[in-house]
């Protein structure tokens, strides 16, 4: 069994300063855990590179919105 | 942590409306997808209606599509959900919920909920 209590928390510490294309992102997960500084959106690109954004900013709830509707479209 | 409280619900004849609201206590409201789940006596969770964060987008089961009507004031941290011609059907506990995580309607990708709210219909 996984030891939760121990599990390891991921946290970010500054946000990017640009704005990233929707085209280069594949997905997103929100940090809200108290151990952490800041409440942040990490987006996982198409290479999977990750980048810490601030889920504030307008184009980061707007590209968390554009990859939630993508979730809808069947895959063919 | 986000706190979600609903309020509205009631008794209400067929044919009648009521307006759910939710309220949010997240300092970052305008950044969580928001969706309302309801659930009857004996019966799982179902989902009835989501809205994006932006509340450009919004999408319905096709039970309460055209009748139900989601909105948001992100300035207020409150989401809605504007019931209309409700049927004896209806009857549930409705949940609003913070959806954190990719997905849309799905539950599983709805991380915060409130405590519900009690819509009875009576025929």
């Known amino acids: 069994q996984p030891d939760a209590i121990n599990a390891p928390v991921t946290c970010c510490y500054n946000f990017t300063n640009r704005k990233i294309s929707v085209q280069r992102l594949a997905s997103y997960r929100r940090i809200t855990s108290s151990k952490c500084p800041k409440e942040a959106v990490i987006f996982k690109t198409i290479v999977a590179k990750e980048i810490c954004a601030d889920p504030k900013q307008k184009w980061v709830q707007d590209s968390m919105d554009h990859l939630d509707k993508q979730t809808q479209t069947p895959k063919t | 942590e986000v706190q979600l409280v609903e309020s509205g619900g009631g008794l209400v004849q067929a044919g009648g409306s009521l307006r759910l609201s939710c309220a949010a206590s997240?300092?970052?409201?305008?950044?969580?997808?928001m969706g309302w789940f309801r659930q009857a006596p004996e019966k799982e969770r179902e989902f009835v209606a989501v809205?994006?964060?932006?509340?450009?987008?919004?999408f319905y089961s096709n039970s309460v599509k055209g009748r139900f009507t989601i909105s948001r004031d992100n300035a207020k941290n409150t989401v809605y959900l504007q019931m209309n011609s409700l049927k004896p059907e209806d009857t549930a506990v409705y949940y609003c919920?913070?959806?954190?995580?990719?997905?849309?309607?799905?539950?599983?990708?709805?991380?915060?909920w409130g405590q519900g709210t009690q819509v009875t219909v009576s025929s």
């Open positions: 919920a913070a959806g954190a995580q990719i997905g849309w309607a799905e539950a599983s990708t709805y991380d915060y």
């Open positions: 997240a300092r970052t409201f305008s950044s969580y997808r």
């Open positions: 809205i994006s964060r932006s509340g450009g987008d919004t």
